[in-house]
C-alpha cells in the first residue's frame, strides 16, 4: 500500500477507522511543461530496434488510451538496412498506476491498478547458450 | 479530464454538483501476475544504448520512489565494446499517473499528477542537418 | 482467403539472374507480415532465402547475401527475388511465403512454388 | 547460424499409433523477450509446406489435435497420438529466433 507519513494535523494513520478509500481530485497537474515537446516521437522509426505503437482503449480506466509498443523485428536494423540476428530487439515495459472504476460504469469511484506496458524497444546483445 | 460513462445507476456526472473529486480505494489491483518475470531487468547492461537507473524519492507522492534512466552513452556501442558516435542513445520517455497528497503530509487526500519520465534507452539514428 | 503466387521464368542460364515476382492477394502487403523466399532443390530440405518486411526491412541468408535482393512494389501488390550469378546448384522449387510478423513469426501462407532450373 | 537437427529422418509407423520426431538446435532458441520461436511445418507430397506448430507448442488454426509440440531451450519434440493416412509426408522443424534455418526433414511413412 502508499507509507503514509505522520502529521500531526491530520487523522493517525494507525486508527482502525482510517480509510482505505481515499479522495483524489481529478483536475489534473502536468508536471511536464519544461520537457521537449517532440520526446520520443520518433524514435519509433529512428531506433535500431524500431517499434509499433498499438492503441489499447478500454474506457473502464483512467487513462482510458493506452499505447502499447511491439517491437517490429526480432533481430535489431543494421546501417544498411538489413535485420541482424546477432542482436535482439526487446520491449522495455514499465508498471504504471491507472484508475480503475469500480463498481464499473461509476464515474466517481475508482480502484488503483498496477498495469505492466511496453513503452519502447531497446537492442540487447543476447545470452548465447550453446550445446555442449 | 476523465471521459465519465452514462450508467442510470451512478449520480448524473452532467449535475453541477457532481465532484471533481472522487473516491480511489488504495488497495491496488496488480495486473502483472501472468507476465514474464525476466521483464526488462537486465536490459539496461546489454542494451547497445545502456543506461543507469537513478532513484527519484518524493514522500509526497504515490508511488514514492520512480526510478529515472539515464543513457550512459551519447553514441551507441558496438559489439568490439567501443561507442558509435555515428547513432545516438536517447531516452524513451513516458508520461505517467502519480498520486500527490494535498494539502501536503495529509494521508487521505490527493491530487492526479502527469509525469514525464524515462524509462529506457534506444539507439537511433541521428538527423544529420548538412551546411548549404 | 489469403494467396501468394509465384511467376517467373523456369529456365535461367548459368552466371545470369534468377528473376521471380510474387503476386499477394486477399492480404496488404504493408500490413504486419514478412514476405520470404525459401528454395527447396530436388528431393532437399528447405532453405529460407531471405524476406522484406512491411516496413521495407530486409534480411538475407548470409550464404546468398552477395547475390540476392528482394525488394517490393506495393502498388501492384507484389514482392520480387533477384538472384545473381546463379549455378546449377540453384536449381529449386522457389516458394514466396507470408511470414506472421507481428507475434508468432512463422511462414502461414506458402505459394505453390516454381521450379527454376538453371541449366545452358 | 543455428543447425537444427531432426531425429529419425524416415519413420514408418503404424496407421493409429502414435509417433514422435526429434528437433535439436545448436544454440538455445529463446529469445532475449523470453519467447522460443520453433514451429513446425508439415509436407505432403506434391504440396508446398503448411505450418502446424508455433512458438514450440502452440497448434496453428486447422491443425488436428493429435498433432502436440513440447520442448524448450534447444530440444524439441513433434507428437502425433494416432497416425492416420492423411499424415503421411516430410515434417521441418523451422527456428526464427535467430537467422531462419529449417531441420533436414523426417520422411513420415504407413508400415
Known amino acids: 500500500g502508499i507509507a503514509i507519513p505522520r502529521n500531526s494535523g491530520c487523522p493517525n494513520s494507525e486508527d482502525k477507522n482510517f480509510p482505505r478509500t481515499v479522495m483524489v481530485n481529478l483536475n489534473i497537474h502536468n508536471r511536464n511543461t519544461s520537457t521537449n515537446p517532440k520526446r520520443s516521437s520518433d524514435y519509433y522509426n529512428r531506433s535500431t530496434s524500431p517499434w509499433n505503437l498499438h492503441r489499447n482503449e478500454d474506457p473502464e480506466r483512467y487513462p482510458s488510451v493506452i499505447w502499447e509498443a511491439k517491437c517490429r523485428h526480432l533481430g535489431c536494423v543494421k546501417a544498411d538496412g538489413n535485420v541482424d540476428y546477432h542482436m535482439n530487439s526487446v520491449p522495455i515495459q514499465q508498471e504504471i498506476l491507472v484508475l480503475r472504476r469500480e463498481p464499473r460504469h461509476c464515474p466517481n469511484s475508482f480502484r488503483l491498478e498496477k498495469i505492466l506496458v511496453s513503452v519502447g524497444c531497446t537492442c540487447v546483445t543476447p545470452i548465447v547458450h550453446h550445446v555442449a | 479530464g476523465i471521459a465519465i460513462p452514462r450508467n442510470s445507476g451512478c449520480p448524473n456526472s452532467e449535475d453541477k454538483n457532481f465532484p471533481r473529486t472522487v473516491m480511489v480505494n488504495l488497495n491496488i489491483h496488480n495486473r502483472n501476475t501472468s507476465t514474464n518475470p525476466k521483464r526488462s531487468s537486465d536490459y539496461y547492461n546489454r542494451s547497445t544504448s545502456p543506461w543507469n537507473l537513478h532513484r527519484n524519492e518524493d514522500p509526497e507522492r504515490y508511488p514514492s520512489v520512480i526510478w529515472e534512466a539515464k543513457c550512459r552513452h551519447l553514441g551507441c556501442v558496438k559489439a568490439d565494446g567501443n561507442v558509435d558516435y555515428h547513432m545516438n542513445s536517447v531516452p524513451i520517455q513516458q508520461e505517467i499517473l502519480v498520486l500527490r497528497r494535498e494539502p501536503r503530509h495529509c494521508p487521505n487526500s490527493f491530487r492526479l499528477e502527469k509525469i514525464l519520465v524515462s524509462v529506457g534507452c534506444t539507439c537511433v539514428t541521428p538527423i544529420v542537418h548538412h551546411v548549404a | 482467403q489469403v494467396q501468394v503466387q509465384e511467376s517467373g521464368p523456369g529456365l535461367v542460364k548459368p552466371s545470369e539472374t534468377l528473376s521471380l515476382t510474387c503476386t499477394v492477394s486477399?492480404?496488404?502487403?504493408?500490413?504486419?507480415?514478412?514476405w520470404n523466399w525459401i528454395r527447396q532443390p530436388p528431393g532437399k530440405g528447405l532453405e529460407w532465402m531471405g524476406y522484406i518486411t512491411y516496413s521495407g526491412t530486409t534480411s538475407y541468408n548470409p550464404s546468398l547475401k552477395s547475390r540476392i535482393t528482394i525488394s517490393v512494389d506495393t502498388s501492384k501488390n507484389q514482392f520480387s527475388l533477384k538472384l545473381s550469378s546463379v549455378t546449377a546448384a540453384d536449381t529449386a522449387v522457389y516458394y514466396c511465403?507470408?511470414?506472421?510478423?507481428?507475434?508468432?513469426?512463422?511462414?502461414?501462407?506458402w505459394g505453390q512454388g516454381t521450379l527454376v532450373t538453371v541449366s545452358s | 547460424i543455428i543447425v537444427m537437427t531432426q531425429s529419425p529422418l524416415s519413420l514408418p509407423v503404424t496407421l493409429g499409433q502414435p509417433a514422435s520426431i526429434s528437433c535439436r538446435s545448436s544454440?538455445?532458441?529463446?529469445?532475449?523477450?523470453?519467447?522460443?520461436?520453433l514451429h513446425w511445418y508439415q509436407q505432403r507430397p506434391g504440396q508446398s509446406p503448411r505450418l502446424l506448430i508455433y512458438k514450440v507448442y502452440n497448434r496453428f488454426s486447422g491443425v488436428p489435435d493429435r498433432f502436440s509440440g513440447s520442448g524448450s531451450g534447444t530440444d524439441f519434440t513433434l507428437k502425433i497420438s494416432r497416425v492416420e493416412a492423411e499424415d503421411v509426408g516430410v515434417y521441418f522443424c523451422s527456428q526464427s529466433t535467430h537467422f531462419p534455418t529449417f531441420g533436414q526433414g523426417t520422411r513420415l511413412e504407413i508400415k
Open positions: 486477399g492480404n496488404s502487403i504493408t500490413s504486419y507480415y514478412a
Open positions: 544454440q538455445s532458441l529463446v529469445h532475449s523477450n523470453g519467447n522460443t520461436y
Open positions: 511465403a507470408r511470414e506472421e510478423y507481428d507475434d508468432i513469426y512463422a511462414v502461414d501462407y
